[in-house]
């Protein structure tokens, strides 16, 4: 190996200068005693190398590239060998940006998977390998004092979310949570969230059903629908409020919202609708009065208003 490149830094801010040195050993006797060292960035020859013989007989060329504007490139030093270019050594150069502060960190507690799922926006492209780590700790108070650290949560490559499993969670106790982004040019941290996992619980929605007509109950009036819902059992003991939305199946009408309805209502007569019209209905719920996240909308129920006993059919779409 006749030549060796060393660089001031292999990874720099995009647009920053970079200085490189190429040294050719004296014992490369088959070479021209006064070889001219050439520099190449990618496929382009780079002028401006300053060459000198050192006291030990080695040859050195130093070049300063004033602005590295490629996010990735190979810098090589070479000699003319006959009528071809003989590459002595090359290094990979990378340029990019330190990570921006991750923002919009939010979490939700999934009671079925028993995990706290947090997501964030990573910010602009850094052009460099950048790792994200969800960091957290348990806290007895309002996260001013740090309790036990929780094992770091590292998302899969390219993902901006991570799940903290139940074994690392303590319900009804605050946790400090933040995202750390790191690459070769620096580290940044999102603002810290302080939350009790139960305060970000996202419940499953109830299942809408038609009310079975009973002999003693009066049939619904024209423009009315009778419906009931079956709460999601594992969330039954959590106080919730719900809301219903409906729209005619035909036409371009937007959803009309009805609520709040207590989860416990379990049944409801919706009036003021167009008679003899097919409607699509959905329901969703949220922990209340304590904090929580809205559930997804339930699968749709399709019902038809009528002046006689209502006819109906179920149609579930999952979103």
């Amino acid at each position: 190996e006749c030549g060796h490149i060393s660089v001031s830094a292999p990874i720099v801010h995009l647009g920053d200068p970079i200085t490189a040195s190429c040294i050719i050993k004296q014992n490369c006797s088959h070479l021209d005693p006064e070889p001219q060292i050439l520099w190449r960035l990618g496929a382009e020859l780079q002028p401006g190398g300053r060459q000198q013989r050192l006291s030990d007989g080695t040859q050195e060329s130093i070049i300063t590239l004033p602005h590295l504007n490629h996010t990735q490139a190979f810098l090589s030093c070479a000699l003319n060998w006959g009528n071809s270019l003989q590459i002595l050594d090359q290094v990979e150069l990378r340029a990019g940006y330190p990570p921006a502060i991750p923002h919009n960190l939010s979490c939700l507690m999934n009671l079925t998977t028993s995990s706290l799922i947090c997501q964030w926006e990573p910010g602009p492209e850094t052009h460099l390998p950048t790792s994200f780590t969800l960091k957290s700790f348990k806290s007895r108070g309002n996260c001013q004092t740090q309790g036990d650290s929780i094992l770091d949560c590292v998302p899969k490559d390219g993902q901006s979310h991570c799940s903290i499993p139940r074994k690392h969670l303590l319900l009804y106790q605050n946790m400090g949570i933040w995202v750390q982004a790191e690459n070769a040019l620096g580290t940044s941290m999102s603002p810290q969230l302080c939350l009790d996992p139960m305060d970000v619980v996202k419940l499953e929605p109830p299942m809408l059903r038609t009310m079975d007509p009973s002999p003693e109950a009066a049939p619904p009036q024209a423009g009315c629908l009778q419906l009931s819902w079956e709460p999601w059992q594992p969330g039954l003991h959590i106080n919730q409020k719900c809301e219903l939305r409906h729209k005619p199946q035909r036409g371009e009408a937007s959803w009309a919202l009805v609520g709040p309805l207590p989860l416990e209502a379990l049944q409801y007569e919706l009036c003021g609708l167009l008679p003899a019209t097919a409607y699509t209905l959905q329901i969703r719920c949220i922990r209340w009065p304590l904090p929580g996240h809205w559930s997804d909308w339930s699968p749709s129920l399709e019902l038809r208003t009528t002046e006689r006993a209502p006819t109906h059919h179920h149609h579930h779409h999952h979103h």
Partner: antibody
Framework: EVQLLESGGGLVQPGGSLRLSCAAS????????MGWVRQAPGKGLEWVSS????????PYADSVKGRFTISRDNSKNTLYLQMNSLRAEDTAVYYC???????????WGQGTLVTVSS | DIQMTQSPSSLSASVGDRVTITCRAS??????LNWYQQKPGKAPKLLIY???NLQNGVPSRFSGSGSGTDFTLTISSLQPEDFATYYC?????????FGGGTKVEIK
């Protein structure tokens, strides 16, 4: 401090009725589900019934369905269990308990003994 | 209905022993599993809720683990006041069901 105090237990003949009460203090009673759990002498725990915070949802164990009625009076912070058509196998200590959001029982009252015997 | 099977039904152990009690659900219940301790003549006391959360005031030698159908209550170093009967309970759906209990006795 959260406290639950049961009363109303005693000796009753088969086919008879009894009404248990549970007085609650130390928490906002109207925000929580409540429940009854019983324990026959020398046996394990058996869930009997629960009631939602406003009283609209009242699941029962199959063994008491149609005979027992759970109710609550949020203005009096009191939970009730009306027991009709009592049988010998209903003999047990009856505990009232507050239900947590994910369905655990805590705390429990001290229990009241119901004995059904002729 | 979900069945809850606890094992063993009884065990003998010495102070300082590590004790493990298992509870198996007949179908998946996520983490909706709670553990109670009951001493003779007393009301049950909640130890662990949602499979692994230690109730306030319960010593840290008690721990819970598991999810789905298989759950474990562990007492890392048995103390004299731990001799009692332990029950698991599922709260995934109604009817709420308790395990048959495990009596921990002094060897």
């Amino acid at each position: 401090e959260v406290q639950l105090l049961e009363s109303g237990g005693g000796l009753v003949q088969p086919g008879g009725s009894l009404r248990l009460s549970c007085a609650a203090s130390g928490f906002t009673f109207s925000l929580y589900w409540m429940g009854w759990v019983r324990q026959a002498p020398g046996k394990g725990l058996e869930w009997v019934s629960s009631i939602s915070s406003s009283g609209g949802v009242t699941p029962y164990a199959d063994s008491v369905k149609g005979r027992f009625t759970i109710s609550r009076d949020n203005s009096k912070n009191t939970l009730y269990l009306q027991m009709n058509s009592l049988r010998a196998e209903d003999t047990a200590v009856y505990y009232c308990a507050k239900l947590g959001e994910l369905g655990w029982f805590d705390p429990w009252g001290q229990g009241t003994l119901v004995t059904v015997s002729s | 209905d979900i069945q809850m099977t606890q094992s063993p039904s009884s065990l003998s152990a010495s102070v300082g022993d590590r004790v493990t009690i298992t509870c198996r659900a007949s179908q998946g219940i996520s983490s909706y599993l709670n553990w109670y301790q009951q001493k003779p003549g007393k009301a049950p006391k909640l130890l662990i809720y949602y499979a692994s959360n230690l109730q306030n005031g319960v010593p840290s030698r008690f721990s819970g683990s598991g999810s789905g159908t298989d759950f474990t209550l562990t007492i890392s170093s048995l103390q004299p006041e731990d001799f009692a009967t332990y029950y698991c309970q599922q709260s995934w759906e109604y009817p709420l069901v308790f395990g048959g209990g495990t009596k921990v006795e002094i060897k």
